[in-house]
């Protein structure tokens, strides 16, 4: 039963996006009074795992020696102290890449784009998928989702950028995912370098600008669209 104890902190090392077969360690940090740590995985019998605390008792380690589909998912942890169980931690979403072969990422009309013009990043999969994700390296909001509705799977998703500013320049990759689990992603596409040229350096848009004034990917999500009109792909980001 959840008590007044502060919630623990949950994180993964080296990160929460792990390639198939690689190791990952999940850490749960509570307080020095903790006697036991419990890790729960959504849609799995609870507890998923229990661990005794490591000295000085304020955290526990949950080891995954080789990442597989079974480990991908949403986790929360708790700790038990003499007065009872803590509140749950904020969730940790452990994502596995390598579940599917890589999609193809291209830029239309070209990866060389003049500031102020438009460009569309196109992520294509040779088999039907229902989620496409566009990731920009070193971006504050790296995950741009395009998810299909009603199970209507697609071979591609378009991520338009207009008008382009210098902030859009950089290295992009995309992933695709199947309806089995949104915690299972494809291998990453080969990287695409988007090069923005222009006689004047565009000022960095402020995070308060609306999407219609073309804030860059570091500031707020792009507005993706389906590969064809009424394609059943739904805009979604996080």
């Amino acid at each position: 039963q959840a008590g007044p104890l502060p919630k623990p902190t949950l994180w993964a090392e080296p990160g929460s996006v792990i390639s198939w077969g690689n190791s990952v360690t999940i850490w749960c940090q509570g307080t020095l009074e903790a006697r036991e740590y419990r890790l729960d995985k959504e849609e799995s019998p609870a507890p998923w795992d229990r661990q005794n605390p490591l000295e000085p008792k304020n955290k526990a380690r949950f080891s995954i020696p080789s990442m597989t589909e079974d480990y991908a998912g949403r986790y929360r942890c708790y700790y038990r102290s003499p007065v009872g169980w803590s509140q749950p931690s904020d969730p940790l979403e452990l994502v596995m890449t390598g579940a599917y072969s890589k999609p193809t990422l291209s830029a239309l009309p070209s990866p060389l784009v003049t500031s102020g013009k438009s460009v569309t990043l196109l992520c294509q999969s040779r088999s039907p998928m229902d989620t496409f994700l566009l990731i920009k390296e070193r971006a504050a909001h790296p995950l741009l989702h395009l998810r299909s509705e009603h199970g209507a799977q697609q071979h591609q998703a378009e991520f338009p950028m207009s008008p382009v500013t210098s902030v859009h320049g950089g290295t992009y990759r995309c992933f695709s995912s199947h309806g089995f689990s949104h915690y299972l992603l494809s291998h990453p596409s080969d990287p695409l370098e988007l090069i923005v040229s222009g006689s004047l350096e565009d000022p960095r848009p402020s995070p308060t600008r609306s999407v219609s004034t073309a804030a860059g990917p570091e500031d707020q999500p792009l507005m993706p669209t389906g590969s064809v009109p009424h394609s059943g792909l739904r805009r979604h980001w996080e």
Epitope: E69, G98, A99, Y100, S101, S127, H178, H187, D190
Partner: antibody
Framework: EVQLVESGGGLVQPGGSLRLSCAAS?????????ISWVRQAPGKGLEWIGS?????????YYATWVKGRFTISRDNSKNTLYLQMNSLRAEDTAVYYC???????????WGQGTLVTVLE | DIQMTQSPSTLSASVGDRVTITCRAS??????LAWYQQKPGKAPKLLIY???TLASGVPSRFSGSGSGTEFTLTISSLQPDDFATYYC????????????FGGGTKVEIK
Amino acid sequence: EVQLVESGGGLVQPGGSLRLSCAASGFSLSSSYWISWVRQAPGKGLEWIGSIDSGSVGITYYATWVKGRFTISRDNSKNTLYLQMNSLRAEDTAVYYCARHGDNWALDLWGQGTLVTVLE
Amino acid sequence: DIQMTQSPSTLSASVGDRVTITCRASQSISSWLAWYQQKPGKAPKLLIYKASTLASGVPSRFSGSGSGTEFTLTISSLQPDDFATYYCQHGYIRGDLDNVFGGGTKVEIK
């Protein structure tokens, strides 16, 4: 050397079963590829049977005409792909190829083929 | 379903001729089209991918064009080694397909 080598073909009676193998060398079947089985009946064109994704989930798709008679699987530890064929018919007589889909979505690597003959 | 229709099914030509083979998809396949050459008793050999890109080691007399639903393979000057059967193939993989290949075009000596 990067190659695919099929084996397991031979003579089989109608209604019988056969398992073909496709051994990959020079690259890993668990890297980011699709692998397809393709067949060619004597004097006929190329016919796609089905494909398996090399990702860890191993999604498979089959041609509509397969109707559950054939199953594609793989063993990553042996770097080998399989085609299990059941309820074989005379019209399944063909050379069976495995082929790799490259980054360009084309079949850039083919095996030499193995002949399956379904004969009374 | 995506149907691939190749024409002609047979083509008689002479050495030095310019030869054109057409492949039509029943719906748009973007540029995901490949062309293969096959000789009797041999596995197919990739000639062109992504509609117009020449595969490694393929002579420059071969060229491909088209996008969407209409595609063409051209041999600018037919050589003795080019008498073979040619197939087109789309790059999509899914469960509603009868085949990913066209029916083939046999290029024979006139």
